[in-house]
Every structure is written in C-alpha cells, then in structure tokens.
C-alpha cells in the first residue's frame, strides 16, 4: 500500500514538476527590468529563452523572437538545451512511469519490470529536475554578473557629452517557476527510486532441499512469502497541493485611438 | 469620439489650492493619464501621471511636493491637485491620454489658472 | 532629467518650401529591446492644445498629412515638413517620452516667410 502511495504521488509531483519546466521554459519573463527606487524608463522590457518584450505605459506590448541562432550568447544556448533536455527526458519519464504505476494492470508484466521502470522513470526525472535546475541557475547566475557589470557602467558616459543609462535586468518569475519545478520534478524522482525497492520481488537465500520418503518421492521446497499490497487505489483523501508561484501579469491589448486599454 | 473635457477657469489667491478636473469620454478609462503645464509663451512641462486602473501615480520631483493626482472611477474623472500656489503657477494645465510610444494622442482643452493677490 | 534642445528657436519658410527641424537629447532615447526611438513631435496652434503628429521618431499618426516626417535615431531627431503649407504655421514640440520625467523641447515658432 505504501509503495503504491509513493510511486503514485511520486508521478504526481513529478508530473506538476515537468508542468513546470514546460512553462518556465516558455514563459517571456526569464530576465525582466530592474525597477527598485523608481521606473526610470516610461518602458519595461523584460525578457525569456526565445524572444525578447516591451511592455509600454500605453499599454502596448510588442515581441521579438530571437531570429538568429549563432548570433545568440552561448550561455543562452547552453541554458535553451539544458532545459529542453530536462523536458525531453522528464516526458520519457512519465512515459515510462505511466506503464511502471503498480495500479496500472498491463498484460501479464512481472513486478520485476514495473520495478525496473519505476526506477528508470525515477532515475530520469532525477536527471530532468537537475537540468531544469541547472538551467535556470545558469541563467540566474549570467543575470548576476551582468546586473553588477552594469552597475558599476551604469552613470559612466560614452566619452562624449551624451550619457546612457543601461537598462539592469533582474530575476524574471521564470527563474522562480523553474527552480521551483526542477525541485519537485528530482523530489518526484526520489520518490520513484524509492518506490521501485519496494516493489522490487525479495529475494531468498533459502536452497530447495529434497526429503525422501520410502513409499514414494515427494520434494518440498519452502518458497518466500511475498505481502502483497493489492491494486485497490489509497483511499485516503490526500490533497497534493502546487507550491509553484502563480504570476498574473497585466493583459494588455493594443490601445487604439478610441480605446487605449 | 474620445474626449478629455477640463474644469473652467480658476483664479486663485496666492498660498491657496486649486484641484482641476479631467473628465473622459468615449473610451475606455483604464490607461494613464497625464498632466501637462504650459506658462504663458512658454513650452510645455510634464506634471505626473496616474493609472485609471489601479490608482497608481508618478510626478515630477520638481512638482511632487505641492501636487496630487486623484481619480474617480465612477465618473471616469481625474483631479489634479495643486497647492501652495504662487504666481509662476499662473498657466494653462493640460490633461492627456496616452498612445503608442507613450505619446499623448488626446488633450483636455486646458484649464487657465491665474494666482493673483 | 533629459534635456531636450530645440533648433532653432523660429524658422521663417516660404508656402512649398521645406521646413526642418531638429531636437537634440541629453541621453539616448532608443529601447534596444524593441529597438524603437520614444520621441515624439507635437503641432501646437495658438489658443489650442498640442496635436500628435509623429511618434517612436517617425511613425506618422493617423489623419496627419504625408508631408510631415520625422528621422533619426539615438540623440539627434528631425521633423520635416516638404512642403509648407499655410495651415502649418504653429509652434512645435518634441518630447522624450522614453525616461522619466517625461521632457519637452523649447518649442520651434514655424512662420511663412
């Protein structure tokens, strides 16, 4: 029963957890303006993986995709493949864990193979979770050393008389999502790793012995005894809560000239 | 047709307040809206803004202290507020709404405020 | 603040002739994340409110004739008209509308010579 619990809420978390990765991985808002003290700018851009944003006090808000592919920071690139290397391998994993769930009946497959899906399945969302998390940290860290490099140039003139305030860029809600995601898709991993000793067969170390009657041969062989947890669903009532943030941004539609959102 | 109808005329006494009034019509009130001064044969300057929206303003340093912006949405109308007057403040105040680049698409007729003792 | 520089202060241009004029701003006013100029021209005829004619540098609003245009990008900006006509004799506004405080410019008095 317990085995079943796990590795069902281990599916669950890790499902939410890949959830999570998918939309950090889409979300616009990787790396947005920095606006402690004041807005400076009467614009605020903000940024993700695939395009960049600006958002107007108009209301106005215009997208770009990143259109080019060798011009982009490798930094950005490595960030992009760790994360969709994270959602690649946790889609394998659920996809696995689907055929591995013990309450799941498929033909007649031996627990020992639930067992060793389960622990695949584990062993990927571990893996996915680490990427996700590697990703996003990757990205947060570049979004650090940018944030003091431009600090530290942000009053400097360019040598003449114009000035450039540079824009900072600060964590964006993907970073939080992200992080928060990887850690329940390596929690939900976990979870399946320890689910599959439980529903891995037990061993015995006990040898046949054979006992000779005179009459006739009868062989006795004292087997394991295995409990088996049965394949009804827990019905306690337990209520599996998302610990991820929930961002309402601003929906802005174009202003036109009679109805400036 | 979008409108930005202003308060009449104010004359007012050295040290005292003036709030002006900016009525919209014809669309719907939910971006900022600007204020604008314009002394006599002078340029324009920028007061503040506020948001129809969620009440939230930014001013100018330079008039901060002595200004108010306020809303009331039930009637789509702005006030702006201006206190301790002194005679520099005699002008005409525009109110505006706002457009793509953040430009001001729409004005209010413009209120003439004259600080006079 | 952003100091926004209006040249020259009045222009005087004969009707057809074509009339230019420039601002200047302390700081750039291009946003490299959509790279557009918040700059913008007003047309402000005595007694009357300021009238949008161009914004992001050079995007014309709606209703305004094809002779006004507007250029540059950065710090240096221009309005022109390519042919003046009589109806576009008026004072003229650029403002930053990229940093906070919003600025204007001096104002340039267009007149027929």
């Known amino acids: 029963m317990a085995v079943t619990a796990c590795q069902g809420l281990g599916f669950v978390v890790s499902l939410i957890g890949i959830a999570g990765i998918i939309a950090a991985t889409c979300m616009d808002q990787w790396s947005t303006q920095d606006l402690y003290n004041n807005p400076v700018t009467a614009v605020f851009n903000y940024q993700g993986l695939w395009r960049s944003c600006v958002r107007e006090s108009s209301g106005f808000t215009e997208c770009r995709g990143y259109f080019t592919l060798l011009g982009l920071p490798a930094m950005l690139q490595a960030v992009r493949a760790l994360m969709i290397v994270g959602i690649v391998l946790g889609a394998i994993g659920l996809l696995v864990s689907i055929f591995a769930l013990k309450c799941i009946r498929i033909g007649s497959m031996e627990d020992s193979a639930k067992a060793n899906m389960t622990l695949t399945s584990g062993i990927m969302f571990i893996v996915s979770g680490l990427c996700a998390i590697a990703g996003v940290s990757v990205f947060a860290n570049m979004l650090v050393t940018n944030f003091w490099m431009s600090t530290a140039n942000m009053y400097t003139g360019m040598g003449g008389m114009v000035q450039t305030v540079q824009t900072r860029y600060t964590f964006g809600a993907a970073l939080f999502v992200g992080w928060v995601a990887g850690g329940l898709t390596l929690i939900g991993g976990v979870m399946m790793c320890i689910a599959c000793r439980g529903l891995a067969p037990e061993e015995t170390n006990y040898k046949a012995v054979s006992y000779h009657a005179s009459g006739h041969s009868v062989a006795y062989k004292p087997g394991g005894f295995k409990a088996s947890t049965g394949f009804g669903s827990n019905t306690k009532n337990k209520k599996i809560y998302d610990g991820g943030a929930r961002t309402e941004d601003e929906v802005q539609s174009y202003p036109s000239k009679h109805d400036y959102v | 047709q979008v409108q930005l109808v202003q308060s009449g005329a104010e004359v007012v006494k050295p040290g005292a307040s003036v709030k002006l009034s900016c009525k919209a019509s014809g669309y719907t009130f939910t971006n900022w809206v600007h204020w604008v001064i314009q002394a006599p044969g002078q340029g324009l300057e920028w007061i503040g803004e506020i948001n129809p929206t969620n009440a939230r303003s930014n001013y100018n340093e330079k008039f901060k202290k002595r200004v108010t912006l306020t809303l009331d949405r039930s009637t789509s109308t702005v006030y702006m507020e201006l206190s301790s007057l002194r005679s520099e403040d005699t002008a005409v105040y525009f109110c505006?709404?706002?457009?793509?680049?953040?430009?001001?698409?729409?004005w209010g007729q413009g209120t003439l405020v004259t600080v006079s003792s | 603040d952003i100091v926004m520089t209006q040249s020259p202060d009045s222009l005087a241009v004969s009707l057809g002739e074509r009339a230019t004029i420039n601002c200047k701003s302390s700081?750039?006013?291009?946003?490299?994340?959509?790279?557009?100029?918040?700059l913008t021209w007003y047309q402000q005829k005595p007694g009357q409110p300021p009238k949008l004619l161009i914004y992001?540098?050079?995007t014309r609003e709606s209703g305004v004739p094809d002779r006004f245009s507007g250029s540059g990008s950065g710090t240096d900006f221009t309005l022109t008209i390519s042919s003046l006509q009589a109806e576009d004799v008026a004072v003229y506004h650029c403002?930053?509308?990229?940093?906070?405080?919003?600025?204007f410019g001096g104002g340039t008095k267009l007149e027929i010579k």
């Open positions: 700081q750039s006013l291009l946003n490299a994340g959509n790279q557009k100029n918040y």
């Open positions: 403002q930053n509308n990229y940093y906070y405080p919003l600025t």
């Open positions: 505006a709404g706002i457009y793509y680049g953040n430009s001001f698409a729409h």
């Open positions: 992001w540098s050079s």
